[in-house]
């Protein structure tokens, strides 16, 4: 029986050209985590596996670190990358557990540059 | 030297639940540096990589299947299996099981080439 | 997912003739291409990993060549016992995706 949980960051929002950190967290469960895939929508972002360390995607290879822990850090966003995440943990003995994240990616703000250039 | 064999099935019912299964001889399936595959071919047509599962369980499915894909392991009998559900017409192949090596280092893994194929089992989708 | 298209489709060759078959990818997948042979009926058969390296048993008429996104497989001096459909291969980038393969009939 599946009793495990997964928390996410849920709905999170970055600016463009900053930099995110996707994170999930299996919880109520002793099953041992054996791999965990990050995609979003069907394209793969990463896979970290516990006897080999991480497959990182050469589409994302520049943009994508692994960490912290097993969790996927995203550099360099652009709006593009607005959409969902998905972390997908397989565990054993349990079996496969999946965590959603929503991530807008938003213009930098008119407020911000203006406090960068005020007059004094 | 490391063979496989697949088994299952000829003749599956449209609608119905596609079950394969992959014995590993002369080698064990719990490798770290192996990961285990399916690919099918279509009658007259070329190759198409289902899936892979790793020994720990680990697996990642061809998105254009993966609604109805399910990879699984059994390290104790040293065979990986294959269920396809919901099929049709279209799913009718012949349907291979092959070893994958793994590089890694550094805390990072590639996926090499498909050393090892099983011999193929034909599938056929029909009522 | 990375494309990889071969051509060409076909091929009617004569004994001892030169044969090229070539494999391009939609994007760069640096030196993770593959080659496999088929024979009718027969499960393919490893030929050559990372571009260039052959398989133990490998006849020394086959070799490959090329890096990013472009690589040839070369027959030398082709023999009646290779006729068959090869098949270039893609590991860099998951998912995992064959060439659409290129029959060689012997004339």
């Known amino acids: 029986m599946m009793t495990g949980t997964i928390e996410t960051t849920g709905n999170i929002s970055a600016e463009k050209g900053g930099s995110i950190i996707l994170q999930c967290h299996l919880s109520s469960t002793t099953a041992q985590v054996t791999q965990v895939n990050w995609e979003q929508q069907d394209q793969l972002l990463a896979i970290c596996n516990a006897d080999l360390g991480w497959h990182i995607s050469p589409s994302f290879k520049d943009r994508v670190a692994p960490g912290p822990g097993l969790g996927l850090t995203l550099q360099s966003l652009t709006v593009n990358d607005t959409g969902e995440y998905f972390c997908i943990y397989h565990t054993y003995p349990d079996g496969t557990y999946t965590g959603r994240i929503f991530l807008e990616v938003l213009e930098s703000s008119v407020a911000e540059h203006g406090a960068r250039f005020q007059i004094p | 030297q490391v063979q496989l064999q697949e088994s299952g099935p000829g003749l599956v019912k449209p609608s119905e639940t596609l079950s394969l299964t992959c014995t590993v001889s002369g080698g064990s399936i719990s490798s770290v540096y192996f990961y285990w595959n399916w690919i099918r071919q279509p009658p007259g047509k070329g190759l198409e990589w289902i899936g892979y599962i790793y020994y720990s369980g680990g697996t990642y499915y061809n998105p254009s299947l993966r609604s109805r894909v399910t990879i699984s392991v059994d390290t104790s009998k040293n065979q990986f299996s294959l269920k396809l559900n919901s099929v049709t017409a279209a799913d009718t192949a012949v349907y291979y099981c092959?070893?994958?090596?793994?590089?890694?280092?550094?805390?990072?893994?590639?996926?090499?080439?498909?050393?090892?194929w099983g011999q193929g089992t034909t599938v056929t989708v029909s009522s | 997912e990375i494309v990889l298209t071969q051509s060409p489709d076909f091929q009617s060759v004569t004994p001892k003739e030169k044969v090229a078959i070539t494999c391009r990818a939609s994007?760069?997948?640096?030196?993770?291409l593959h080659w496999y042979q088929q024979k009718p009926d027969q499960s393919p058969k490893p030929l050559i990993k990372y571009v260039s390296q052959s398989f133990s048993g490998v006849p020394s008429r086959f070799s490959g060549s090329g890096s990013g996104t472009d690589f040839t497989l070369t027959i030398n001096s082709l023999e009646a016992e290779d006729a068959a459909t090869y098949y270039c291969h893609q590991s860099s980038s998951l998912p995992l995706t064959f060439g659409g393969g290129t029959k060689v009939e012997i004339k």
């Open positions: 994007q760069s997948i640096g030196s993770s």
């Open positions: 092959a070893r994958g090596s793994i590089a890694a280092g550094g805390g990072y893994f590639y996926y090499n080439d498909m050393d090892v």
